[in-house]
């Protein structure tokens, strides 16, 4: 399976909701012993390897914000804990999933990465990633809604397996 | 840069508990899952357990399920790990290293220097 | 649980001279999905801390000299240290990380 970024980058003004979106592509084992992640975490422009490292988005880990099913599968975080820091991650059955921002602040600019984690046998685990860049704007030079850039072609399938 | 920093070495009799600390520093706590290694004198390494600093859940190895207990402290960005009843067996240098998993197993990147550990009458 | 075991126990070699230390799991490291093996090298330094050379069986670890390099799949491991350097004199493991954490019991790769 891979990772699609729909958008690699967001301009939003300062007090915008955002929601960033990530798309699993391919086939996906659905098999009984198979579990799926999917999560988000923040991470930094400048490694070796994009999202390799990772940070808290407001706080909050990728388990905090992770959602877990087999293959395709509707899915959103009814965390309380989420919604206290204006954070919801949702998942849909046709592969779309995305965490929504509320009242963005400078603090929200950075690096933002989606990972879909595959577990066998509750171990072994085998993971994809896509990235995408959020920008929080203020003052006259601000849009007034998000305004979203297209990935290139190469940058969609962003497929980044470890 | 990424660094573990543990605590002191420890002399202690049998039956006594032990409890090691590992400082983390350099990158985000509590993103990374925190494992503890001993080995002992000669020997190779023996995974005892690790924990995620996050949630604070903690996995261990069957063999020390019984007598190990792994805390985090967010605050200081600092693990640790208790071990009781200690039995001269239990003499090693005890490990922290970071892993890079998200919800399974991975390799270990970032060791900690080591904490020996006697337990002698 | 899935057993490592390392082979020889030491290894004597002069410096210069190539060294090859194997490893071999109970069971097979390979990942279906990715076709990756779930296994690590270590180096170990007397009185010092494990250091990772090599993980996915063959990716070096960065700043690891390419002298030490990582083959093999499945259930046979191979690590091969080029042509030796006195600092490379040390106790080497395998680690498997696929199904829990267990490690090999080490090759001491000595000065011959």
């Known amino acids: 399976f891979k990772v699609a970024t729909p958008y690699s980058l967001y301009v939003c003004p300062e007090g915008q909701n955002v929601t960033l979106t990530c798309r699993l592509l391919g086939p996906v084992d659905k098999g009984h012993d198979v579990t799926f992640y999917k999560t988000w975490y923040r991470s930094s422009r400048g490694e070796v390897q994009t999202c390799s490292e990772r940070r808290p988005i407001r706080n909050l880990t990728f388990q905090d914000l992770h959602l877990h099913h087999g293959g395709h599968q509707a899915a959103n975080t009814s965390h309380d804990l989420a919604q206290r820091h204006g954070l919801e991650s949702a998942s849909d059955h046709h592969g779309n999933f995305s965490i929504t921002m509320r009242n963005l602040t400078l603090l929200d600019s950075g690096l933002y990465c989606c990972l879909v984690v595959e577990i066998r046998h509750h171990h072994s685990e085998h993971r994809v990633h896509g990235a995408m860049e959020l920008q929080v704007q203020t003052g006259k030079d601000a849009p007034s809604n998000c305004v979203v850039y297209p990935s290139s072609s190469q940058d969609s399938e962003n497929i980044t397996a470890a | 840069q990424v660094q573990l920093v543990q605590s002191g070495a420890e002399v202690k009799k049998p039956g006594a508990s032990v409890k090691v600390s590992c400082k983390a520093s350099g990158y985000s706590f509590t993103d990374y899952y925190i494992n503890w290694v001993r080995q002992a004198p000669g020997q190779g390494l023996e995974w005892i357990a690790r924990?995620?600093?996050?949630?604070?859940?903690?996995y261990y190895n069957e063999k020390f399920k019984d007598r190990a207990t792994l805390t985090v402290d967010k605050s200081t960005s600092t693990a640790y790990m208790e071990l009781s009843s200690l039995r001269s067996e239990d003499t090693a240098v005890y490990y922290c290293?970071?892993?890079?998993?998200?919800?399974?197993?991975?390799?270990?990147?970032?060791w900690g220097q080591g904490t020996t550990v006697t337990v002698s009458s | 649980n899935i057993m490592m075991t390392q082979s020889p126990a030491t290894l004597s070699v002069s410096p210069g001279e190539r060294a090859t230390l194997s490893c071999k799991s109970s069971q097979s490291v390979l990942y279906s999905s990715n076709q990756k093996n779930y296994l690590a090298w270590y180096q170990q330094k007397p009185g010092q801390s494990p250091r990772l050379l090599i993980y996915w069986a063959s990716t070096r670890e960065s700043g690891v000299p390419d002298r030490f390099s990582g083959s093999g799949s499945g259930t046979e491991f191979t690590l091969t240290i080029s042509s030796l350097q006195s600092e490379d004199f040390a106790v080497y493991y395998c680690?498997?990380?696929?199904?829990?954490?267990?490690f090999g019991g080490g090759t001491k790769v000595e000065i011959k």
């Open positions: 290293a970071r892993d890079d998993s998200f919800y399974g197993y991975w390799y270990f990147d970032v």
């Open positions: 680690h498997q990380y696929l199904s829990s954490y267990t």
């Open positions: 924990i995620f600093p996050g949630s604070g859940n903690a």
